[in-house]
């Protein structure tokens, strides 16, 4: 697994460097997670042809993965910093159950999957410090998450591979949108 942000040898070798600002730390954290997702997607796509044929192989996708919409205020048109930050944090909290599902779904990238999960927890903490309106953030219900996890794990192997692919793709898109939005804040 790659070294988490702030722990690479360059950082150790340059103690005179200015400490990262909160925004820089968040930016770096997201890019680190995106690198991890790329590695996981590589294993998933190499293992099956899910990455090319996912659209035509499905009639319905009821995964309900978090997605950015116009009303969330994260796009350039209608940008709203507070609304967007709430959406990013809420979305990441919703993704956590899916990241839990990804554990044990990888053979050669097991550590990488764990790193993505743990780094996302850290990212949520960074973002919560930045948010003024924490009351607007809804935390997913643990009971609902537990039954969702059971449902996902009860799927057959092919559906689980497809689920893994869709989670990684959606999480990547969500993080990329978040990164663009946070750079405007």
């Amino acid at each position: 697994a790659p070294v988490p942000p702030g722990e690479d040898s360059k950082d150790v070798a340059a103690p005179h460097r200015q400490p990262l600002t909160s925004s820089e730390r968040i930016d770096k954290q997201i890019r680190y997670i995106l690198d991890g997702i790329s590695a996981l997607r590589k294993e998933t796509c190499n293992k099956s042809n899910m990455c090319e044929s996912s659209k035509e192989a499905l009639a319905e996708n009821n995964l309900n993965l978090p997605k950015m919409a116009e009303k969330d205020g994260c796009f350039q048109s209608g940008f709203n910093e507070e609304t967007c930050l709430v959406k990013i944090i809420t979305g990441l909290l919703e993704f956590e159950v899916y990241l839990e599902y990804l554990q044990n779904r990888f053979e050669s990238s097991e550590e990488q999957a764990r790193a993505v999960q743990m780094s996302t927890k850290v990212l949520i903490q960074f973002l919560q410090k930045k948010a003024k309106n924490l009351d607007a953030i809804t935390t997913p219900d643990p009971t609902t998450n537990a039954s969702l996890l059971t449902k996902l794990q009860a799927q057959n192997q092919w559906l689980q591979d497809m689920t893994t692919h869709l989670i990684l793709r959606s999480f990547k898109e969500f993080l990329q949108s978040s990164l663009r939005a946070l750079r405007q804040m």
Epitope: E56, A57, L58, A59, E60, N61, N62, L63, N64, K151, L152, A154, Q155, N156, W158, L159, M162, T163, L166
Partner: nanobody, 124 residues
Framework: QVQLVESGGGLVQAGDSLRVACAAS????????MAWFRQAPGKEREFVST????????YYADSVKGRFTSSRDNAKSTSYLQMNSLKPEDTAVYYC?????????????????WGQGTQVTVSS
């Protein structure tokens, strides 16, 4: 486990109608999707139709759209495929399949449980 048994196949003339049924038994409460596939001699198994078992939403292959209709009877845990305007190319063994999960597939690999199939022959 879920057991599936198809019935209602037979020999019909082109242009006729036929309704095949699929009765599910066992752990039917775990079913999220019920589908129909078919396999003609020497050909690969082909998707015909699938249904979200809880909402009743249906999806069809382009080749049967407008001619075939899928329906269900929840109380009897039975799925039906009404086939109208049948063509000789509809001749195949029709299989019923069921799956658990949040994704509803048009790919046979997305289904856990299968019936033994019922033969439908359409003569010209």
């Amino acid at each position: 486990q879920v057991q599936l048994v198809e019935s209602g196949g037979g020999l019909v003339q082109a242009g006729d109608s036929l309704r095949v049924a699929c009765a599910a038994s066992g752990r039917t409460f775990s079913i999220d999707a019920m589908a129909w596939f078919r396999q003609a001699p020497g050909k690969e198994r082909e998707f015909v139709s699938t249904m979200n078992w809880s909402t009743g939403a249906t999806y069809y292959a382009d080749s049967v759209k407008g001619r075939f209709t899928s329906s269900r009877d929840n109380a009897k845990s039975t799925s039906y495929l009404q086939m109208n305007s049948l063509k000789p190319e509809d001749t195949a063994v029709y299989y019923c399949a069921a799956a658990r999960g949040l994704l509803i597939a048009t790919d046979a690999r997305g289904y856990d449980y299968w019936g033994q199939g019922t033969q439908v022959t359409v003569s010209s």
